[in-house]
């Protein structure tokens, strides 16, 4: 798994307009990140979740569907 700043496993705010950047706070990193939509090349990156792009780091980040965890939302959350 990637680290929490690059691939936060907790839900954060998603951009309303997929073409625009937005600010959001991830629970794990406790810092503000600037997000945009992910490049389409990442359409299969998040297994059970939605992809967003960390603009400053140029890296994808997954916002997992409920009941899933992991950098790519690839694991079932046994505690859910």
């Amino acid at each position: 798994d990637g680290n929490s700043t690059r691939s936060p496993e907790t839900n954060g705010l998603l951009c309303g307009d997929p073409e625009e950047n937005c600010a959001a706070t991830t629970t794990q990193s406790k810092r503000k990140g600037h997000f945009s939509r992910c490049p389409k090349q990442y359409k299969h990156y998040c297994i059970k979740g939605r992809c967003r792009f960390v603009v400053a780091e140029q890296t994808p980040s997954c916002v997992c569907d409920e009941g899933y965890i992991g950098a790519r939302c690839e694991r079932v959350d046994l505690f859910y």
Epitope: P39, Q41, Y45, Q58
Partner: antibody, heavy 120, light 107 residues
Amino acid sequence: QVQLVQSGAEVKKPGSSVKVSCKASGGTFNDYAISWVRQAPGGLEWMGGIIPIFGNANYAQKFQGRVTITADESTSTAYMELSSLRSEDTAVYYCARSSSTYGIHAFDYWGQGTLVTVSS
Amino acid sequence: DIQMTQSPSSLSASVGDRVTITCRASQSISNFLNWYQQKPGKAPKLLIYAASNLQSGVPSRFSGSGSGTDFTLTISSLQPEDFATYYCQQYDDFPMTFGQGTKVEIK
């Protein structure tokens, strides 16, 4: 400093195959995607690339079935094999490293290029 | 595939001139666009990534702007070493595609 060193020029017959190598030094080889880009008089053309996080190669539809891109982690070397060569495949072939671990973004390091000439 | 169209295909300019090259994508690519410079017999060199970010070591006279489908590379004051061919490249979707290039020549 990252360096990508490619194998030498090749002259091939139509219908044959060519395999070009790209040896990386000065960085962690399996941390970044490696792509192959060719340049003929028409301009630059992305052929495909290997993304470490996925482990498999992604190819441009145009070359699907004719190109194979592989990587040998033990020698920090990437390979591009193009089969069923035709005269239109005459070009300079570059390997290029992506600036990202996760996908193919900007190509921040390039090999010196390998001229492949296809002629009968 | 996403088509990238550059204009002009070539231009003549003098040292000190301000030069602008445009790149248009056939569909919106957000800001997932890079610019390269290439000199004869050499590999391309990354100038700008993510539409407007200057690559480390690249002179500040180079700048990029744009989002969506329309992008611009600007050289604020052309230097002798800037005479070259410039390419844009999108990385929104596979396959990665390049513009056809803009050759900047000496007037």
